[in-house]
């Protein structure tokens, strides 16, 4: 499963998407910064092997692709770079689901990646809460896509994992 | 290794125009925010632009309002500052400086810094 | 605009001993989000600034543990538990809670 490769270059085509999505300027929104505690803590001091990377990476993407598939965020961003960035979400899904089905012969205890996929889930909760919060205003979708595109960058610090043979 | 090269300064005469360059490497130039800060000779510092990742985004203080543009080449992984009208209160060293990934909470921290390059405006 | 404002020079210390710098803002930098936006930088000599200190009390990367920050939302505190000869320079505070951002005037550390 060659995935480091492919999905470093999916990520960045993502992240160079979600930059240009940018309908608002960031500076007018100052009122409207968010914490919204992505957990890097968690992450940082554990040792992920290949399967574990793949299932939090893939929870990760999937939240996103949900987060960005509702008809708020269609009202939100200009459509074909929606489109295109969906469709890069997509084909990383995909991807990350061939590369779980080759892995298949290696056993994990499925409980070993509950606490990481739990706090990932809880993460865009939070996310989805404060744009409920805030009426999905445009500054509110505009603080969302900077923390979106804070935590893609956060997943190159998984994916060394997926370098590494179980 | 994260660095800011910077080049550009000059002595110029008031009225006149410069541009200043910073050129990065050793991180992904295009998904980071950029400033330029200035330290004039008493050694105040004070900021000067801000330009987001992507470049559609830009903030000056009325001191250099219409006066200063900062730009960027995500190709080239430069940063830009062109400055025109120029005033001798404009005599400062500049630095380039990158903005911390802050996400949603938009930390605008300056996590790395330019060596500085030197504008004197005089006649 | 909000101002910084920030003593010259601090109370000369020696070496080994602790120092504290204090910056003061003109409005409170606590946003409604909890974070604080203070920052903390110090310049040593002939060199560029460097950050020490984000969100008033988290120490950037490679700072030493001696470098600590605290305060209220208007009045900061910058302590260095150990001064040290490397840590000669000017420390700047400054604040990223509105455009445009400012920066104190800078407080040289003075060593006895």
């Known amino acids: 499963c060659d995935l480091p490769q492919t999905h470093s270059l999916r990520n960045r085509r993502a992240l160079i998407l979600l930059a240009q999505m940018g309908r608002i300027s960031p500076f007018s929104c100052l009122k409207d910064r968010h914490e919204f505690r992505f957990p890097e803590e968690e992450f940082d001091g554990h040792q992920f092997q290949k399967t574990q990377a793949i299932s939090v990476l893939h929870e990760m993407i999937q939240q996103t692709f949900n987060l960005f598939s509702t008809e708020d965020s269609s009202a939100a961003w200009e459509q074909s770079l929606l489109e295109k960035f969906s469709t890069e979400l997509y084909q990383q899904l995909n991807d990350l689901e061939a590369c779980v089905i080759q892995e298949v012969g290696v056993e994990e205890t499925p409980l070993m990646n509950e606490d990481f996929i739990l706090a990932v889930r809880k993460y865009f909760q939070r996310i989805t809460l404060y744009l409920m919060e805030k009426k999905y205003s445009p500054c509110a979708w505009e603080v969302v896509r900077a923390e979106i595109m804070r935590s893609f960058s956060f997943s190159t610090n998984l994916k060394k994992g997926l370098r590494r043979k179980d | 290794e994260v660095q800011l090269q910077q080049s550009g300064g000059d002595l110029v005469k008031p009225g006149g125009s410069l541009k200043l360059s910073c050129a990065a490497s050793?991180?992904?130039?295009?998904?980071?925010?950029m400033s330029w800060v200035r330290q004039t000779p008493d050694k105040r510092l004070d900021w000067v632009s801000i330009?987001?990742?992507?470049?559609?985004?830009?903030y000056y203080p009325d001191s250099v309002k219409g006066r200063f543009t900062i730009s960027r080449d995500n190709a080239k992984n430069t940063l830009y500052l062109q400055m025109s009208s120029l005033k001798s209160e404009d005599t400062a060293m500049y630095y380039c400086?990158?903005?911390?990934?802050?996400?949603?909470?938009?930390?605008?921290?300056?996590?790395?810094w330019g060596q500085g390059t030197s504008v004197t405006v005089s006649s | 605009d909000i101002v910084m404002t920030q003593a010259a020079f601090s109370n000369p210390v020696t070496l080994g001993t602790s120092a504290s710098i204090s910056c003061r803002s003109s409005k409170s930098l606590l946003h409604s989000n909890g974070i604080t936006y203070l920052y903390w930088y110090l310049q040593k000599p002939g060199q560029s600034p460097q950050l020490l200190i984000y969100?008033?009390?988290n120490l950037a990367s490679g700072v030493p543990d001696r470098f600590s920050s605290s305060g209220s939302g208007i009045d900061f505190t910058l302590r260095i538990s150990r001064v040290e000869a490397e840590d000669v320079g000017a420390y700047y505070c400054a604040q990223n809670l509105e455009l445009p951002f400012t920066f104190g005037s800078g407080t040289k550390l003075e060593i006895k």
């Open positions: 050793g991180f992904t130039f295009s998904s980071y925010g």
């Open positions: 400086a990158r903005h911390a990934e802050g996400g949603g909470n938009y930390d605008y921290a300056m996590d790395y």
């Open positions: 969100q008033m009390s």
């Open positions: 330009i987001t990742s992507g470049g559609s985004y830009t």
